[in-house]
Interface confidence: low
Amino acid sequence: LQDPCSNCPAGTFCDNNRNQICSPCPPNSFSSAGGQRTCDICRQCKGVFRTRKECSSTSNAECDCTPGFHCLGAGCSMCEQDCKQGQELTKKGCKDCCFGTFNDQKRGICRPWTNCSLDGKSVLVNGTKERDVVCGPSPADLSPGASSVTPPAPAREPGHSPQ
């Protein structure tokens, strides 16, 4: 036997008390699928949250964060304070990255500089609080005849020997 409530579309609920009539969702509520016996309450974007998309009878409101904060979690379930590049957020607020670490974003944690020597490379550009080190070529790359970092030779015309 087909459930009569399955005929109730999104935006309505199936009211048991009214012989399973499909009634519209009350204000500030929604049902995104058919056959619901109750409507979900709309999410309210309050405080540090701001409304990115208003609630409708068939879809929930969507929130993002006010300037100076960024979203965390599925569906922006939390707003976390931004920090500057070169900082990370701790329980005591934004703190500069320790020496040897960097953060090139307004969120997240400070990460250690790349250890160039692990790849047998040298440090080409030193790291800062905001930027990772830039690793240069390995000593082997600098040996005569190595082509990996030397610029390509200009194309030669046929029949001409190199000068």
């Epitope: 409530c5 009211d15 009350p26 056959g35 619901q36 016996r37 109750t38 979900d40 309450i41 999410r43």
Partner: antibody, heavy 117, light 107 residues
Amino acid sequence: EVQLVESGGGLIQPGGSLRISCAVSGFSLTTYAISWVRQAPGKGLEWLGIIWPGGGTNYADSLKGRLTISKDNSKNTVYLQMNSLRTEDTAVYYCARGAGTWYFDVWGQGTLVTVSS
Amino acid sequence: DIQMTQSPSSLSASVGDRVTITCSASQGISNYLNWYQQKPGKTVKLLIYYTSSLHSGVPSRFSGSGSGTDYTLTISSLQPEDIATYYCQQYSKFPWTFGQGTKLEIK
């Protein structure tokens, strides 16, 4: 038959935590909301919070931070977790099905929680 | 929070009497009001939802009315099995709140 059965009540020390369950049958948690309501001995009903079909929750302001309502749709079970219990949390805890325009049309029999040292 | 105040807190009436219980909200609740019955030592039962809609299986002697901040539950002819405590509950705004209850006894 639609049924809600609470379990997990008992004697808890002040400062302790509570986790009670509401096992439902005869309907799906993906289409109905479930509320928790408590009743202190000889007192009236107090609404604690609700978990919606989509998993969202709303709580009584007085319990925010101490109360978490969650559910496992596959087990047809809703959970109430409360921390930092006080003697005034002693009550019968009911779960109730939220239907239609948010009336509680079916209630469990309740589980007694006693907070005492 | 919206405060719900029921009156009287208790009342005694005779079988066959017309009984009225009132519920007053601290602000307008747009008819978003339910009534529940709790018999001694028993669980809670829904009587009326959305101010005046009778829940299925509830005797027709129960009725509800009201608007704005003031709402009423009426039992047209009191029966012995109506001995219970009655609660109103608003769902206009979170947190949802109950009245303190009205205890009904038979004279």
